[in-house]
């Protein structure tokens, strides 16, 4: 690696994948193993993330980019950059502090993650229940009895499941 020549900050010429080594007259040295620098002009390289335990490697660390992890089967990612893995549950369940628990009557979860949500209240829209809800599925609302004239068919599909927001950690 050639010694940098910038008149202002000699380190600014060090590319990604290197660091500016003050102990060696500010030459650009390659990042040591298990480290990376994703931008130029770095004074040290960053430690590569390790995907261990419940995490598995989605992308290996390189000299210019960090490793990326996802979760082993039976778990799903939470947080920015998959900072946590959370246990999957079955449809019709939600994860509590005591593990996976069935949705209470009147609630459902159609995914392996997230929380149980209340069935749609058809009567709020002036409709009736066409198909009863289960732990895994929302109710299906149909037309109100007054709308049941011959030829009328207006089945309203349930609203799409909404994922709870996850703040980065």
């Amino acid at each position: 690696f050639e010694r940098t020549r910038s008149l202002q900050d000699p380190c600014s010429n060090c590319p990604a994948g290197t660091f500016c080594d003050n102990n060696r007259n500010q030459i650009c040295s390659p990042c040591p193993p298990n480290s990376f620098s994703s931008a130029g002009g770095q004074r040290t390289c960053d430690i590569c993330r390790q995907c261990k335990g419940v995490f598995r490697t989605r992308k290996e660390c390189s000299s210019t980019s960090n490793a990326e992890c996802d979760c082993t089967p039976g778990f799903h990612c939470l947080g920015a950059g998959c900072s946590m893995c959370e246990q999957d549950c079955k449809q019709g369940q939600e994860l509590t502090k005591k593990g996976c628990k069935d949705c209470c009557f009147g609630t459902f979860n159609d995914q392996k993650r997230g929380i149980c949500r209340p069935w749609t209240n058809c009567s709020l829209d002036g409709k009736s229940v066409l198909v009863n809800g289960t732990k895994e599925r929302d109710v299906v609302c149909g037309p109100s009895p007054a709308d049941l004239s011959p030829g009328a068919s207006s089945v309203t599909p349930p609203a799409p499941a909404r994922e709870p927001g996850h703040s980065p950690q």
Epitope: T44, C45, Q50
Partner: antibody
Framework: EVQLQESGPSLVKPSQTLSLTCSVT????????WNWNRKFPGNKFEYMGY???????YYNPSLKSRISITRDTSKNQYYLQLNSVTTEDTATYYC?????????WGQGTLVTVSA | DIKMTQSPSSMYASLGERVTITCKAS??????LYWFQQKPGKSPETLIY???RLVDGVPSRFSGSGSGQDYSLTISSLEYEDMGIYYC?????????FGGGTKLEIK
């Protein structure tokens, strides 16, 4: 040369919020991972958490309900807030950039929690 | 959390003596280990990274070794300026955790 400098009150009352600033020169906080650690009387160190180049944060689970690390890239500073402090939070607080082959440390600032 | 058990917690040694400090992790840390030296009133300085790689500018009398759960820092011939507190730190897994420190004093 990379320099980190902690600043903030040296005395905080119990139940109040401890607020510290780390001012960085010679490097940009828009790259890398910027950390807070503390050293208790008796020389035990604790890792507190980081804020990253992308503004994501990690907090030690032992502090998670009380800690916040934020930054201001225009000032090249990052901040520590620790809520509901007790006398157990009396320590020397250090900001650091862990790295390979170099780890950069601030000089540390002693914060005493006392009524 | 990974627990780092460092020993001894304090020791006296003579100038020129060979000194070894150890750190044991509660699980395999894949050599993701720093050794730091802290002198009174100063911030810590990195001596070793990745368990056995000497930081540029650190005297060659310092060396690190180990793998898996067991690591050590050796000073081959103690000098007066080596007194201080030595810490290991694992950076294999968050939250990073420190050893309890070894206070090294001159006999």
């Amino acid at each position: 040369e990379v320099q980190l400098q902690e600043s903030g009150p040296s005395l905080v009352k119990p139940s109040q919020t401890l607020s510290l600033t780390c001012s960085v020169t010679g490097d940009s906080i828009t790259s890398g991972y910027w950390n807070w650690n503390r050293k208790f009387p008796g020389n035990k160190f604790e890792y507190m958490g980081y804020i990253s180049y992308s503004d994501s944060a990690y907090y030690n689970p032992s502090l998670k309900s009380r800690i916040s690390i934020t930054r201001d890239t225009s000032k090249n500073q990052y901040y520590l807030q620790l809520n509901s402090v007790t006398t157990e939070d009396t320590a020397t607080y250090y900001c650091t950039r862990w790295g390979i082959p170099f780890a950069f440390w601030g000089q540390g600032t002693l914060v005493t929690v006392s009524a | 959390d990974i627990k780092m058990t460092q020993s001894p917690s304090s020791m006296y040694a003579s100038l020129g003596e060979r000194v070894t400090i150890t750190c044991k992790a509660s699980q395999d840390i894949d050599s993701y280990l720093y050794w730091f030296q802290q002198k009174p009133g100063k911030s810590p300085e990195t001596l070793i990274y990745h368990a056995n790689r000497l930081v540029d500018g650190v005297p060659s009398r310092f060396s690190g070794s180990g793998s898996g759960q067991d690591y050590s820092l050796t000073i081959s011939s103690l000098e007066y300026e080596d007194m201080g507190i030595y810490y290991c730190l694992q950076y294999d897994e968050f939250p990073y955790t420190f050893g309890g420190g070894t206070k090294l004093e001159i006999k």
